[in-house]
Structure formats: structure tokens, C-alpha cells
Interface confidence: low
């Protein structure tokens, strides 16, 4: 007949498994429950997809590796006390006293609760690395920890090549022994130790779960460490960089971390699972029975099959592990688990010129003599394109690319973003937002879903801010609708007169000329440069101030560069800012200082892009790595990254005006990258590609 | 409850620098618009300038190129700077909040801070 | 720069009376966006102004029911209808319609 065989890790598992399948059949449990032994929870998820075995209950970290790596899937969750439900939070505390924040957590000495842990170490660990705070290079999540903090107590660090600093705040027990053990040995062990190493003042943080403040404060501890510490005297930090009482944990934590879970193979019925278990759990749950399904004390250990703090286990309605494990515990892990032995010794950087070769070469041999991990290649392509076949192919690992590339590459070959360039802030050149101005005095005021019959002035054609965004924008939302891809004659006729220089003037429609004005001698007329007064940012914003048009597609720099007394040009010289608005997609006008809020899109800055299956966080740490040596323009280290005068060229792998290779955060698809509105725009012009 | 304190020397000679600092508590000035507002002996209210949350300014044109504001996010303090002060500049200095919630009407000002001019 | 013009410049009052005070913008102070921008204030002796009244006739949080605003294009009312000693001061409006924003010379509220 039909039978549950159940996954064993230790000799005490397996003889309280057997107990439990004892129980289970003395009762008329239908399936029979079987006792598989493996010798660790990896070796029976392996045992599991190989059809060995069929269930195991498993913690979040390693229900992320069965689902991702075998295809199992979580089906009956564990619940522990009632507030929470299927899961804790894991919380970073500090004293209130401090100014410590999310953001500021370099060089601050913290308490961990052990190598290994969830709260105390792969949650805050993972998040600081998925964020982007915390960079990695070839995997070494040690060293990159120890060289983050100030110092640590992280108790099971000992043998670890950092002890020095992971065990430097620990001080084992009353007489100075078990320093650093992962037992109680050590003082600053487990949830109440890592908590009592922040309130002694040895750290400045503590990564503990929700309910460790509030169990260990206002006279509910014993020991005399605790007794006359207030709750009040602590903080939680929160992902947006703020702080919050120790109460507001929902709102206010790293992660949620799931409870366990028993997981089982994609092809298991985890509704027969549920229906063992729970048949189970009604009959051998409570204080008395013959069997205790969520008491391990009489095998002399803890948390053997379920965790002893197990109230009831409840079905999982979606049965997959991302869904299970939520987001914000998700990308911890995806932070977190990086195999050495499964890190490719090269990344192939692809080159498209022979002075970027040079560059490239210059770059491998600089981060070759740092020891940096992994080391570049330089693989030549002939195009962008070229690039993204071959690192599609897997021939090549990455490459830095402009926005509509990045599109390309992400649309058409998959790729995904794993660091971006970040400018200086005031460098609007390379990073800007596109946006609609108007005349704020327009006694007929119009939103931007009302253009159609407007005149309007625009940059130049194929100009990202004055043609390709906007027009593509009208396009996508529908109100430009071209006929047999000529988007020419759409725009011409959408709006009633306009002004877009061109170069190339041939079938160009003659409503797109009409607002221009040439030089000053009439002369030039709709000339794609600076003879036409009305071209470029400067001159569309010019068009319209001089009335010649209603709308102008300009950077959101453009209306502060030539107003209050910026640009002296007898046109701009009177010109106040708050005499213009913006036209938000949302149909609003708004002050020109919201453009963060109400534009068309935001240019977005460079991204290195690589496959899917790549880590990125491996691509990132070594950037950063390299960034710190190598990264200012005038470092002594023998190679600049975000230079390429020395090579006769611009922008050679990187941009020039790069100050920082940045984390993609959360931004980790071309979409999320992009932003929605400038993704929507390409595809407004990408749709006219016949 | 929204604080605005304003702080600096209250003697300047001419043709010198006046600073100002406005510290700010109970809101950030990364929202909403941050201002400098003057009240000569005699009455008169002139407005002087600000800077918004996005670190655009906007000065009275009648100070012409002698303003200057300036912030400091970290502090949550925004500045003032007037340069080659005359007898003229004598006068109480505000600074006071604008927000969306009172249509920028001026809701919570500074205790201000008087500066005389002279030599 | 938008003129406005606040009379009388003192206003004599008994405690309990009705006071009125008036101001005029040199030009009309209604946004195209259909808004009108004119605010009063109060300046006690010794103190820094407050925000009495948004936008012609809205009153700010904490300010007393006897406080009223009216007024449209360029004339503006200010009514307080019973004075209290607590009144005593400098009234001020301010039009912000227009760039940069403008103040009315004043209004001495003070007892006969």
C-alpha cells in the first residue's frame, strides 16, 4: 500500500521518527509513516528528489536550496506562538542612545547570535549583501563581514580563518573559557547573549529576533545582566534607514524569516501529506499523550523532526518555495548563498574596440596583481548586439551598456543588470529626467493627455529627452497613433506646428519645422545644431518662452540653467522658474522643482548586464573591490578604471564621468533597471520598428 | 511640534558677509519649501528666498546675485548668505516653513534674529 | 513686484468689539489654476509672525472661530469679531499667487 517515508538526520531523529510511526499506526493513521536515515538535512533533500525518501522538515535557508537546486516543494508550515504565525522576524537592535542606522552599520561592532544562524547571521549578512551595503568578493562571505564591522562576536567563528575579529567582542564564560564558542560557554551566545553583548556596550548592534528585547528587559530576565535594562532604552533600525520602537517589529524588521516547513517532491501530493500530519498533531500534540510529536526532551535533544516550539501545522496553500519564504527572506538568501567551488575562476569582459581591448587588457593585469577574484578576460565583440549573442551563448560574461541596449539585452537575450554607474550628483548629462514644461500662466491651462492640436518644441530628432521619450511615450499611451510606422507624419499631424531640428531634412514634414527660427539672419532654418536658436535643450526651452510653442521636451535641468539670472542671454536673462510647470503622466501639473515626481521618464544611468544564472553579487564585490584601488581618477595604483584619456579614447568600459560602480539593489531585472516609464517609452518607438 | 531656530552674529560691518543658520526640528527639510523672509525697522516684510526639498532655490530677484541658500541635510539646517551688506540689510532675518498643507502659505516661522549693519 | 496695500495702518479697538481689517492687491491675485494665494498673519509684540489664515479665507490649525477671511480678486477682508487681549499685534497679509511672494505694510491692532 501506500506509504510516507520520512527523512532522519541523527540517531536521536531517527528513534523518535520511529516512535512517531509507532503512534501513528497504533492510532490508524492511514498512509504508514516510514523512518528513511540520511546524515544531514542536504543529504536527505538528496535522498528526496532522488525518490528514496519522500518529506523532511526544513528551516528557510535550506527550504531556498531544495526548492531552487532539486524542485522540492514546501507543503505543511510549522506555527509557533499565535501572534506571529507562520513565522518570526529577524530585527537588527541598537541603543537608543547611538545614532547607528542601516546605513551606517560599516565599522560599527556587532553581536551575532552564531556562525551560521538564521537571525544572527544569514538574514542580516544576506540582506547587507543583497542591498548592496555589503559587497562580496569570490564568495569569501568571511572575510567581507569581518572587514564590514568593527569588530563582531559571532560565536562558532573560532575555527574560521577571521577569528580575530569575528570573535573579538566575545568573552566566554565567568572564567574566560569557551570564548567564541557556539554554546553557552559563551556569554554573548544565542538570542539573549547577542542581545546582552549590545546592552554591555561590547557592540553597537545586535542581530536578534522580535520578541529578544522584549524578553530580556523590564525585569523579565533573571540573571543580573538584565535586570534593570528598559526596553524602552532600544531601537530597531528599519530598511529605509529609520528607526522605530522595539514593538514595531512587523513594520520594522530585515525579514521575515518562515517557519520550517516540511518539504516534498514536486510530484507528492501535499494534500495526503497534510492530512497524516494533521490526523497526527490532533491526537499527539498535546501535554500527556503517549506520543509528543513537538517535544524532543525525551531523546535528549531539541527541535528533532518538528521545532518543540511548534503549536499546530497548517497546509501550504502555494506551494512553492518563493512563495513560502516571501520576498524579503528570499533575497537574503539570494545574498547569502555563494559557492566557492561553484564560482567560475574568469569573468569574461566583452571589449568592442581595439583601445577598449587595451583598456581591458590593463584592467586584468591591475586586478590580476591585487589578487582580486575572478580574474578578467577580454573577449572582442563587433557591436553591443554582438556582445549580448555571445554572452547569451555563454562566450562572454558581461558588459557595460547604455539604457536602450540594456533594453535590448534584457528583452531580447535575457540579460539582467548586476552593477550600475553612478555619477556625480550634480551631472545631469548622463543621468537626467525627461520632462514636459509648460507656461504656468496659460489662462487655458492643459494636462498632457490634452496635447493633440499644441505646439511644441523639442531638442532635436532622435534627441532622447525632446524626441525618442516623449514621442515614444504618446505612442505607448495611444495618443499618437502612426500609420504604417511613420512616425513622422504622426507626430506632424498630432501636433499643430512644432519645432524638432533634423540633419537630414529629406520627407521630413514641414508642420515639424514651422515653430523654428534659424540664426539670427532667418538663415539655417530647423538645422540640426546651434544655428537653429530654438536647437538642443536650451533652445527647445527657448521656443518655448518665446511663445513660439506650448509644451517643451527638455532635461529637467533645463528650465534651472536658464532661469532665475542662470543663463544671461537677453531671452533668459528675466526668466523665473516659478513661471513654468511640469505635465505629469498622471494628468497633473506640478512645480518644475518635482521632477523627481511628475516626468516622462528617467535616463537611466549604464549598467553592466549578465546572464540570469550569473551571481551577481560576485560581479559586484569584485568591482568594488577593484573600485576602491583603482577607482579614483587619480589613484597611484597603476590603472583607472573610469579613465580612458591614457588610451586615446572616451568611455572605454566604462563611462568617464563614472565616480562609483553602485549595487543594483532591488533593481535586479532590465525592467526594474530602466523604470517602468522608460522602458514604456522605448517600447512606444520600439512598436513603429517595422 | 515644528521648530525653526535661527541663529548667527547680530552686528555686521559693511560690505561684509551676513550668515545666517536655520535649525530645524519636528520635520526634515528634505520636504517642502525652506525660506528666508526679513523685516526692516518700521514694519516693512520682504521676502528673500528659499530653497525646496529637492535643493532648487529661488531668490527675490530685488537681491540679485548678493543671496545665497544653502543646506545641509545631515544637520537638517538650511543657510543664509548675504553678501557686501549696507546699512540697508539692517533688519529682523525669519526663516519659516512652506507647505502643500497650507497652499505655501508660511506655517511655522523662527523667533528671528536681529542684525544690525555697521561699522 | 505685486503691491499690497493693508488699511487702516492702526486700529484702535475696545476688548469685545468687532474688528475689521482690509487689504488690496495692485493686481488680482486668482491663479489661472483658479486659486487665490492670500494669507494672513500675526506678529504679538516680541514674537515672530503665525499663520492665521491660508488662502483667502481657510483658518490654520489652533487659530480661535472668531478669526474670518474673505475677500476676492483684490480686495481681502480680515474679521476678528470679538477681540480678545490676546490679539493685540501686528496684522500682516501676504499674496504668494505671484513671484515673489509680497507683503501688506501692516495693521496695529492695539486698545483704545
Known amino acids: 500500500g501506500m506509504e510516507v517515508r520520512w527523512c532522519a538526520t541523527s540517531d536521536p531523529e531517527q528513534h523518535k521518527c520511529g516512535n512517531m510511526s509507532e503512534a501513528f499506526r497504533e492510532a490508524g493513521i492511514q498512509p504508514s509513516l516510514l523512518c528513511v536515515r540520511g546524515t544531514s538535512a542536504d543529504h536527505c533533500v538528496q535522498l528526496i528528489a532522488a525518490q528514496e525518501a519522500d518529506a523532511i522538515t526544513l528551516d528557510g535557508g535550506a527550504i531556498y536550496e531544495a526548492g531552487k537546486e532539486h524542485g522540492l516543494k514546501p507543503v505543511v508550515g510549522e506555527v509557533y506562538d499565535q501572534e506571529v504565525g507562520t513565522s518570526y522576524y529577524a530585527v537588527a537592535v541598537v541603543r537608543r542612545s547611538s545614532h547607528v542606522t542601516i546605513d551606517t552599520l560599516k565599522g560599527v561592532k556587532s553581536c551575532h547570535t552564531g556562525i551560521n544562524r538564521t537571525v544572527g547571521w544569514n538574514v542580516p549578512v544576506g540582506y547587507l549583501v543583497e542591498s548592496g551595503r555589503l559587497s562580496v568578493m569570490g564568495c569569501d562571505v568571511l572575510k567581507a563581514v569581518s572587514d564590514y564591522f568593527g569588530g563582531s562576536c559571532v560565536p562558532g567563528a573560532g575555527e574560521t580563518s577571521y577569528s580575530e575579529s569575528l570573535c573579538r567582542l566575545c568573552r566566554g564564560d565567568s572564567s574566560g573559557e569557551g570564548v567564541c564558542d557556539k554554546s553557552p560557554l559563551e556569554r554573548y551566545y544565542d538570542y539573549s547573549g547577542a542581545f546582552r553583548c549590545l546592552a554591555e556596550g561590547a557592540g553597537d548592534v545586535a542581530f536578534v529576533k522580535h520578541s529578544t528585547v522584549l524578553e530580556n528587559t523590564d525585569g523579565k530576565t533573571l540573571p543580573s545582566w538584565g535586570q534593570a535594562l528598559l526596553s524602552q532604552d532600544f531601537e530597531l533600525l528599519c530598511r529605509d534607514g529609520s528607526r522605530a520602537d522595539v514593538t514595531e517589529w512587523r513594520q520594522c524588521h530585515l525579514a521575515r524569516v518562515p517557519a520550517h516547513a516540511v518539504v516534498v517532491r514536486a510530484d507528492t501530493d501535499g494534500g495526503l501529506i497534510f492530512r497524516l500530519l494533521n490526523e497526527g498533531q490532533r491526537l499527539f500534540s498535546h501535554e500527556g499523550s503517549s506520543f509528543q510529536m513537538f517535544s524532543s526532551e525525551a531523546y535528549g535533544q531539541k527541535d528533532l523532526l518538528f521545532k518543540d516550539s511548534t503549536s499546530e501545522l497548517v497546509p501550504i496553500a502555494t506551494q512553492t518555495y518563493e512563495a513560502w519564504l516571501g520576498h524579503e527572506y528570499l533575497h537574503a538568501m539570494k545574498g547569502l548563498l555563494c559557492d566557492p567551488n561553484r564560482l567560475p575562476p574568469y569573468l569574461r569582459w566583452c571589449v568592442l574596440s581595439t583601445p577598449e581591448i587595451q583598456k581591458c587588457g590593463d584592467m586584468a593585469v591591475a586586478f590580476r596583481r591585487q589578487r582580486l577574484k575572478p580574474e578578467i578576460q577580454c573577449v572582442s565583440a563587433k557591436s553591443p548586439q554582438h556582445c549580448m549573442e555571445r554572452i547569451q551563448a555563454e562566450q562572454v560574461d558581461a558588459v557595460t551598456l547604455s539604457g536602450e541596449d540594456i533594453y535590448t539585452a534584457g528583452k531580447t537575450y535575457g540579460l539582467v543588470p548586476a552593477a550600475g554607474e553612478h555619477y556625480a550628483p550634480e551631472d545631469s548629462s548622463n543621468s537626467y529626467y525627461v520632462v514636459a514644461v509648460v507656461r504656468r500662466d496659460s489662462s487655458h491651462a492643459f494636462t498632457l493627455d490634452e496635447l493633440r492640436g499644441k505646439r511644441s518644441c523639442h531638442a532635436g530628432f532622435g534627441s532622447p529627452a525632446g524626441w525618442d521619450v516623449p514621442v515614444g511615450a504618446l505612442i505607448q499611451r495611444g495618443f499618437i497613433r502612426p500609420k504604417d510606422c511613420d512616425v513622422l507624419t504622426a507626430v506632424s499631424e498630432f501636433f499643430n506646428a512644432s519645432c524638432v531640428p533634423v540633419n537630414n531634412p529629406k520627407n521630413y514634414p514641414s508642420s515639424l519645422c514651422a515653430l523654428c527660427v534659424g540664426d539670427e539672419q532667418g538663415r539655417n532654418k530647423c538645422v540640426g545644431n546651434s544655428q537653429e536658436r530654438y536647437y538642443g535643450y536650451r533652445g527647445a526651452f527657448r521656443c518655448l518662452v518665446e511663445n513660439a510653442g506650448d509644451v517643451a521636451f527638455v532635461r529637467h535641468t533645463t528650465v534651472f540653467d536658464n532661469t532665475n539670472g542662470h543663463n544671461s542671454e537677453p531671452w533668459a536673462a528675466e526668466l523665473r522658474s516659478e513661471d513654468y510647470e511640469l505635465l505629469c503622466p498622471n494628468g497633473a501639473r506640478a512645480e518644475v522643482s518635482q521632477f523627481a515626481a511628475c516626468n516622462l521618464a528617467q535616463i537611466p544611468p549604464h549598467a553592466v548586464m549578465v546572464r540570469p544564472d550569473t551571481n551577481i553579487f560576485t560581479v559586484y564585490g569584485l568591482l568594488d573591490k577593484a573600485q576602491d584601488l583603482f577607482g579614483d581618477d587619480h589613484n597611484k595604483n597603476g590603472f583607472k578604471m573610469f579613465d580612458s584619456s591614457n588610451y586615446h579614447g572616451q568611455d572605454l568600459l566604462f563611462k568617464d564621468a563614472t565616480v562609483r560602480a553602485v549595487p543594483v539593489g532591488e533593481k535586479t531585472t532590465y525592467r526594474g533597471w530602466l523604470g517602468l516609464d522608460y522602458v514604456a517609452a522605448l517600447e512606444g518607438m520600439s512598436s513603429q520598428q517595422c | 511640534e515644528v521648530q525653526l531656530q535661527e541663529s548667527g552674529p547680530s552686528l555686521v560691518k559693511p560690505s561684509q558677509t551676513l550668515s545666517l543658520t536655520c535649525s530645524v526640528t519636528g520635520d526634515s527639510i528634505t520636504s517642502g519649501y525652506w525660506n528666508w523672509i526679513r523685516k526692516f525697522p518700521g514694519n516693512k516684510l520682504e521676502y528673500m528666498g528659499y530653497?525646496?526639498?529637492?535643493?532648487?532655490?529661488y531668490y527675490n530677484p530685488s537681491l540679485k546675485s548678493r543671496i545665497s541658500i544653502t543646506r545641509d541635510t545631515s544637520k537638517n539646517q538650511y543657510y543664509l548668505q548675504l553678501n557686501f551688506v549696507t546699512a540697508e540689510d539692517t533688519a529682523t532675518y525669519y526663516c519659516a516653513r512652506r507647505t502643500l498643507a497650507t497652499y505655501y502659505a508660511m506655517d511655522y516661522w523662527g523667533q528671528g534674529t536681529s542684525v544690525t549693519v555697521s561699522s | 513686484d505685486f503691491v499690497m496695500t493693508q488699511t487702516p495702518l492702526s486700529l484702535p479697538v475696545s476688548l469685545g468689539d468687532q474688528a475689521s481689517i482690509s487689504c488690496r492687491a495692485s493686481?488680482?491675485?486668482?491663479?489661472?489654476?483658479?486659486?487665490?494665494?492670500l494669507h494672513w498673519y500675526l506678529q504679538k509684540p516680541g514674537q515672530s509672525p503665525k499663520l492665521l489664515i491660508y488662502r483667502v479665507s481657510n483658518r490654520f490649525s489652533g487659530v480661535p472661530d472668531r478669526f474670518s477671511g474673505s475677500g476676492s480678486g483684490t480686495d481681502f477682508t480680515l474679521k476678528i469679531s470679538r477681540v480678545e487681549a490676546e490679539d493685540l499685534g501686528v496684522y500682516f497679509c501676504?499674496?504668494?499667487?505671484?513671484?515673489?511672494?509680497?507683503f501688506g505694510g501692516g495693521t496695529k491692532l492695539e486698545i483704545k
Open positions: 530653497i525646496s526639498d529637492s535643493g532648487i532655490t
Open positions: 493686481q488680482s491675485l486668482v491663479h489661472s489654476n483658479g486659486n487665490t494665494y
Open positions: 501676504s499674496q504668494s499667487t505671484h513671484v515673489p511672494p509680497t
